[in-house]
Interface confidence: medium
């Protein structure tokens, strides 16, 4: 069976941007090889956060994770299973 | 196919606790029929992350966001769907 | 592989229009006060950011989802 | 429901020593800024719960996972 | 400081449309909430819905769908109301109130005067 | 629509006295409420938001508490600058709802 695979890189950087954490971001930039142009655009992203103070954050933030751990997320490691397991069907 | 449920009110509280908002806290709680000591258990735990100040917020957030999207998580909902899926071929 | 939901929103919220970003958020969290942030931040992102910015958001994010920590 | 890697980690926050929990937490997130932040955590609550504190905190959790909510 | 304010009163007769006035000041226009309410002699608040000044996006109680037309001018930091085709109903003290942005909770934190609407031939 | 049921509609307190206004939900509104003092001729003030939390420069003998849907507004040792309409109102779900207000009169 192949596993869902959730992209914890994508996490670091939107938790970094979401909380302001200027350091987290540049972190978790480097990690994926981001050009000066590409860091700039997404401190511009993490201004945003700042400006807005905790409540931003915090909402933001819960959202996210309502999106992550919906039914809409869930269900399509579901889905990539069931898709598999009709190839493996098939191809008997 | 059973799509996975992820337990939403789980999160609410989670975030809550985890963001030191205690009105969000005492909002979840209601949800779940919470007795005044539950709720002051809660409370000791979220003043934990609140003297522990936003690092605490953001490095547990993460954490959290990054097991729920984690193999593991994802993959429990794959299982359940091979399970179905074995129980509805050998029903046949 | 990241979640397509989840890809969809930060797509939104750099590429879409305010509504189209609200009211995808609203599928998931309906609250007002939710909802109504959720405009202040997609509007501050769109003054803030050039049309060469977004590119360059996007840039980053497509080399989030091709890396091997992805 | 509740995914059981989730559960897990929650259970160990409260009923965990604090090795078992940094051990779990290191098993998703393994940076030492994490790590740390996660005995800190734990050994907050550790000193601030009493052994009823606890129970009701995982009273709390069994009506969150019995919740039509979940 | 913040400042939000209305003319004290407003004559229209029944069926002549009118727009009322809220001018804000002492904080940036575009970045807050501006929601307005109702309240007639003797009774409670009321509603009435909100805008958003940065995008023009408003939020109305259905209630006041189709009586009221919230707009705002960014140029002079003023938001407005337009009532339709207005009736005695209508006479009432309207509110602008602008919405607090601290905090994970929503409240009104700064009030204009309130304008006294009259209907009245 | 969610309605916000206040009572009782007025009631005449002597100064020093101790106050307790109500207002219930018709169905979960969370910590979403709000209370608002309101003096004759003038535009109503936030007193207490989220339930429970006093607004900036409001005196602590104003408290707000909430069990379930049931909201209250305490006024310990009441002053006679205290005299005026108390609205509560809700910000859990569109559209925003208030209650039909208690008014606090002197005896």
């Known amino acids: 069976v192949k596993m869902a695979e959730t992209c914890p890189i994508f996490y670091d950087v939107f938790f970094a941007v979401a909380n302001g954490n200027e350091l987290l971001l540049d972190l978790s930039l480097t990690k994926v090889n981001a050009t000066e142009p590409e860091r700039t655009a997404m401190k511009k992203i993490q201004d945003c956060y700042v400006e807005n103070g905790l409540i931003s954050r915090v909402l933001d933030g819960l959202v996210m994770t309502t999106i992550s751990s919906s039914k809409d997320c869930m269900g399509e490691a579901v889905q990539n299973t069931v898709e598999d397991l009709k190839l493996n069907t098939l191809g008997r | 196919v059973k799509m996975a449920e992820t337990c939403p009110i789980f999160y609410d509280v989670f975030f809550a606790v985890a963001n030191g908002n205690e009105l969000l806290l005492d909002l979840s709680l209601t949800k779940v029929n919470a007795t005044e000591p539950e709720r002051t258990a809660m409370k000791k735990i979220q003043d934990c992350y609140v003297e522990n100040g936003l690092i605490s917020r953001v490095l547990d957030g993460l954490v959290m966001t990054t097991i729920s999207s984690s193999k593991d998580c994802m993959g429990e909902a794959v299982q359940n769907t091979v399970e179905d899926l074995k129980l509805n071929t050998l029903g046949r | 592989e990241i979640c397509p939901a989840v890809k969809r929103d930060v797509d939104l919220f750099l590429t879409g229009t305010p509504d189209e970003y609200v009211e995808q958020v609203a599928q998931y969290k309906a609250l007002p006060v939710v909802l109504e942030n959720a405009r202040i931040l997609k509007n501050c992102v769109d003054a803030k950011m050039t049309e060469e910015d977004k590119e360059n958001a996007l840039s980053v994010l497509d080399k989030i989802y091709t890396s091997p920590l992805c | 429901e509740i995914c059981p890697a989730v559960k897990r980690d929650v259970d160990l926050f409260l009923t965990g020593t604090p090795d078992e929990y940094v051990e779990q937490v290191a098993q998703y997130k393994a940076l030492p800024v994490v790590l740390e932040n996660a005995r800190i955590l734990k050994n907050c609550v550790d000193a601030k719960m009493t052994e009823e504190d606890k129970e009701n905190a995982l009273s709390v959790l069994d009506k969150i996972y019995t919740s039509p909510l979940c | 400081q913040v400042q939000l304010q209305q003319p004290g009163t407003e004559l229209v007769r029944p069926g002549a449309s009118v727009k009322l006035s809220c001018k804000a000041s002492?904080?940036?226009?575009?970045?807050?909430?501006i929601n307005w309410v109702k309240q007639r002699p003797g009774q409670g608040l009321e509603w009435i819905g909100n805008?958003?000044?940065?995008?023009?996006?408003?939020n109305y109680n259905q209630k006041f769908k189709d009586k009221a037309t919230l707009t705002v001018d960014k140029s002079s930091s003023t938001a407005y109301m337009q009532l339709s085709s207005p009736t005695s109903d209508d006479s009432a003290v309207y509110y602008c109130?602008?919405?607090?942005?601290?905090?994970?909770?929503?409240?009104?934190?700064?009030w204009g005067q309130g304008t006294t609407l009259t209907v009245s031939s | 629509n969610i309605v916000m049921t206040q009572s009782p509609k007025s009631m005449s307190m002597s100064v020093g006295e101790r106050v307790t206004l109500s207002c219930k939900a018709s169905e979960n509104v969370g910590s979403y409420v709000f209370w608002y003092q309101q003096k004759p001729d003038q535009s109503p003030k936030l007193l207490i938001y989220?339930?429970?939390n006093r607004y900036t420069g409001v005196p602590d003998r104003f408290t707000g508490s909430r069990s379930a849907t049931d909201f209250t507004l305490t006024i310990s040792n009441v002053q006679a600058e205290d005299l005026a309409d108390y609205h509560c109102g809700q910000s859990y779900s569109y559209p925003l709802t208030f209650g039909a207000g208690t008014k606090l009169e002197l005896k």
């Open positions: 805008i958003y000044p940065s995008d023009s996006y408003t």
């Open positions: 002492g904080y940036t226009f575009t970045s807050y909430w």
């Open positions: 989220g339930a429970s």
């Open positions: 109130t602008r919405r607090g942005n601290y905090g994970n909770l929503y409240y009104f934190d700064y």
